[in-house]
């Protein structure tokens, strides 16, 4: 949930009300209880190119 008056988080990150800060979604697999991970599930990280056909 985005705090009022803050800029949207960049791609691959999500707002943490708990920390008053955008946080990197990459940490969520290891730390699933972080509040910002809820926003990461709704906004997956940037797509990547497959290295094989």
């Amino acid at each position: 949930e985005q705090a009022p008056g803050t800029a949207p988080c960049s791609r691959g990150s999500s707002w943490s009300a708990d920390l008053d800060k955008c946080m990197d979604c990459a940490s969520c697999p290891a730390r699933p209880h972080s509040d910002f991970c809820l926003g990461c599930a709704a906004a997956p990280p940037a797509p990547f190119r497959l290295l094989w056909p």
Epitope: L19, S27, A30, H33, S34
Partner: antibody, heavy 123, light 111 residues
């Protein structure tokens, strides 16, 4: 194991600048998600959060004191600093630093505190 | 600022009985899936010690006689059965938004 220790001047006069140091061990302030807060407690009274600094040098302040506060860090020396300008007798308190970082599950509790340093402002 | 009001300010509980401490927030400190309320114990001359994080999650090493509950604006810390070493002042604290604030404290005396 994690430990934090505050140090300060003990006594200073009104209008002076209070400089506090938090020296810590057992964790790194370069770890993503890690942060350190300063909290104070006048004798016999409650707790007041003052400021917080994150691993990436982002900072947050209590709006009621923001104009007087400056928090900073020296990651390589495992130290966090707080300066309070123009102190008055109302700033007399025990000052604590506390770690706020990710636990195993990804919660961010203020889980380790220093023993505190007593500061008296008196003319 | 979110104001946290604790009640009672002090209470005396007999050994082995239940102590119940309330913390009421001036606005909600919860979302649909998260409650940003924490509880600390402080003994004279010592720093606060984290007991419960995020309403009901016991900190490592804290005895199971401590428990927390609540959501929105109303939160409870229960201690049962109370032991002599539980004599202390207890504080609630939220991290829902800045500034992070603490309740005024509840002093627990063991009879």
């Amino acid at each position: 194991q994690v430990s934090l220790k505050e140090s300060g001047p003990g006594i200073l006069q009104p209008s002076q600048t209070l400089s506090l140091t938090c020296s810590f061990s057992g964790f790194s302030l370069s770890t993503s998600g890690m942060g350190v807060s300063w909290i104070r407690q006048p004798s016999g009274k409650g707790l007041e959060w003052l400021a917080h600094i994150y691993w990436d040098d982002d900072k947050r302040y209590n709006p009621s004191l923001k104009s007087r506060l400056t928090i900073s860090k020296d990651t390589s020396r495992n130290q966090v600093f707080l300066k309070i300008t123009s102190v008055d007798t109302a700033d007399t308190a025990t000052y604590y630093c506390a770690r706020r970082g990710p636990d195993y599950y990804g919660y961010y509790p203020m889980d380790y505190w220093g023993q505190g340093t007593s500061v008296t402002v008196s003319s | 600022d979110i104001v946290l009001t604790q009640s009672p300010a002090s209470l005396a509980v007999s050994l082995g009985q239940r102590a119940t401490i309330s913390c009421r927030a001036s606005k909600s400190v919860s979302t649909s899936s998260y409650s940003y309320m924490h509880w600390y114990q402080q003994k004279p001359g010592q720093p606060p010690k984290l007991l419960i994080k995020y309403t009901s999650n016991l900190e490592s090493g804290v005895p199971a006689r401590f428990s927390g509950s609540g959501s929105g604006t109303d939160f409870i810390l229960n201690i049962h059965p109370v032991e002599e070493e539980d004599a202390a002042t207890y504080y609630c604290q939220h991290s829902r938004e800045l500034p992070w604030t603490f309740g005024g404290g509840t002093k627990l005396e063991i009879k």
